[in-house]
């Protein structure tokens, strides 16, 4: 699986999950954040050559395609496959406020 | 230049509700609050509620909690404000505001214009 | 919820002379060492405008002739040199606590 233990510890060049921190404050100016300060949201990025994890059939004739017609554009896109929330803390007013939000943090990917 | 621009004044029959848009522009719309605050004829301004757009968090007065529901579009950078079961007391121009940035409550530094709201049978 | 109260309603007050209107929340808006209170100039027809950010933190554009004070729950706004641009509702609002609440208003007009 193209997860965050196989893609964190290995040097992959093609598509797998890349770890990006973002702090709430510094880089998308939500200072009202209480905790956490920031968090792993990380990424998908990198090539997807025939048989990279496929998603559809979709996705791996595409693949073939791209690998049998190299100067061709069209090719299957790395994208994140299982995501989970973040809860975060927050204060409104004094009255402090839980939430959970949704599909917060990538921990693998996917060709698609 | 951040700018907050609201829908059309509005006349509603009791009972019935009411939705003001608040199109902003020349800022970053899911990195603030928005606000809605309601100013009756020659009264003092109460605050509604708040929205933070990114994933629709809500805080609500609960002066109206039940009948009012904030909602944002990310893609057209517009928030709205639904007001159910209508009445007399409701007759008042409506301003989404934008908050400052600091606090999820906090001062709000950019205003729309304001949507009067009429209520008559 | 926070009562805040302004005083006076309304007031008159010659041109060039400094006016002062007062805030007094019903209980403190400290935390943090912070005074969460800030004051609005509404004009007529217009809606309001931001003029002190916690307290005594002028807001951006706003002439320095407006300047804020206190902390706890006593405030006070004072705005030297008075112009006719000045004119209109003043108010007071606090987010200390939820929910957030504003001042009755103190209307100023010029003798």
């Known amino acids: 699986a193209l997860d965050t233990n196989y893609c964190f510890r290995n040097l992959e060049e093609n598509c797998c999950v890349r770890p990006l921190y973002i702090d709430f404050r510094q880089d998308l100016g939500w200072k009202w954040v209480h905790e956490p300060k920031g968090y792993y949201a990380n990424f998908c990025s990198g090539p997807c050559p025939y048989l990279r994890s496929a998603d559809t059939t979709h996705s791996t004739v595409l693949g073939l395609y791209n690998t049998l017609n190299p100067e061709a554009s069209a090719s299957p896109c790395c994208v994140p496959q299982d995501l989970e929330p973040l809860t975060i803390l927050y204060y409104v007013g004094r009255t402090p406020k839980v939430e959970q939000l949704s599909n917060m943090v990538v921990k693998s990917c996917k060709c698609s | 230049e951040v700018q907050l621009v609201q829908s059309g004044a509005e006349v509603k029959k009791p009972g019935a509700s009411v939705k003001v848009s608040c199109k902003t522009s020349?800022?970053?719309?899911?990195?603030?609050?928005m606000n809605w605050v309601r100013q009756a004829p020659g009264a003092g301004l109460d605050w509604m509620g708040q929205i933070f757009p990114a994933w629709g968090s809500t805080n609500y007065n609960e002066m109206f909690e039940g009948r009012v529901t904030l909602t944002a579009d990310t893609s057209t950078s517009t928030a709205y404000m639904e007001l159910s079961s209508l009445r007399a007391g409701d007759i008042a121009v409506y301003y989404c505001?934008?908050?400052?940035?600091?606090?999820?409550?906090?001062?709000?530094?950019?205003w729309g214009q304001g949507t009067l709201v009429t209520v008559s049978s | 919820d926070i009562v805040m109260t302004q005083t006076p309603p309304s007031l008159s007050v010659s041109p060039r002379e400094t006016a002062s209107i007062s805030c007094r929340a019903s209980e403190s808006v400290d935390s943090y060492g912070n005074s969460f209170m800030h004051w609005y100039l509404q004009k007529p027809g217009q809606s309001p405008q931001l003029l002190i950010y916690l307290a005594s933190n002028l807001e951006s554009g706003v002439s320095d002739r407006f300047s804020g004070s206190g902390s706890g729950t006593d405030f006070t706004l004072r705005i030297s040199r008075v112009e006719a641009n000045d004119t209109g509702v003043y108010y007071c609002?606090?987010?200390?606590?939820?929910?957030?609440?504003f001042g009755q208003g103190t209307k100023l007009e010029l003798k």
């Open positions: 609002q606090q987010n200390n606590e939820d929910p957030l609440t």
């Open positions: 505001a934008r908050g400052y940035g600091n606090y999820a409550l906090d001062a709000m530094d950019y």
């Open positions: 020349g800022y970053t719309f899911i990195t603030y609050w």
